[in-house]
Interface confidence: low
């Protein structure tokens, strides 16, 4: 495989043009020494992209996920 495509952190660059409706599922990666890594699998083409954690809907999603975790 091309060395050029392997990153120390899975996400070094983030896509900010991702609609919530086009996301099949999200993966939050706990990678040491890396910024928050959120990988989305897209519905329309099954590709994986790294999503910008600053997206409003992502922040709302994370907030809800954290609230759920602490309520349990």
């Amino acid at each position: 495989k091309p060395v050029s495509l392997s990153y120390r952190c899975p996400c070094r660059f983030f896509e900010s043009h991702v609609a919530r409706a086009n996301v099949k599922h999200l993966k939050i990666l706990n990678t040491p020494n890396c910024a928050l890594q959120i990988v989305a699998r897209l519905k329309n083409n099954n590709r994986q992209v790294c999503i910008d954690p600053k997206l409003k809907w992502i922040q709302e999603y994370l907030e809800k996920a954290l609230n759920k975790r602490f309520k349990m």
Partner: antibody, heavy 124, light 107 residues
Amino acid sequence: QVQLVQSGGGLVQPGGSLRLSCAASGFTFSSYWMSWVRQAPGKGLEWVANMNQDGSEKYYVDSVKGRFTISRDNAKNSLYLQMNSLRAEDTAVYYCARDLTGPYYYDYYGMDVWGQGTTVTVSS
Amino acid sequence: DIQMIQSPSSLSASVGDRVTITCRASQGISSALAWYQQKPGKAPKLLIYDASSLESGVPSRFSGSGSGTDFTLTISSLQPEDFATYYCQQFNSYPRTFGQGTKVEIK
């Protein structure tokens, strides 16, 4: 909509220089690898160069190494190809393209968005 | 460099025909292969990536298969708009070489 608009082609003498530009819109330009591909008259496609999102990795086909330089300005959503020491065999239509790689090294997605192409003619 | 050899270099077919184009890599490239369609005077269009994944918006009559060194693009029922030149491209290593192209013409 997602698009790449090219400019900068033309007629140049052998040994001359030319800079091609590619303006991106409709997507997060700074998140993508970008490529240049060319097509000589009546011939097939030839991959020329590509670079990663922040410009720290650049790759070239052997025939242009040392003569062509790929660069980008993420603030301007633009990709460039500086072509020096041009030869007759560089005559071609040049395309810029969005080069899709996923977050993991094993994700290969091809080039899904292309510019309209710009013609470079090297002749005396 | 990895050489990509397409066959045939051209073919004549009729609307409704099943068309198969092959691409052979000079060394193994896993599934790191894409297929493009190009019409005269136009930019290429991505059809298939990762050897067999259909690009969004591409008709389902197009399909790709293969892994390693041998790959196939199939058009299950050729339509008038499919007459064009088709290219494979490997993404396994640099330089990212293309096949020489296969021109699909009307019989």
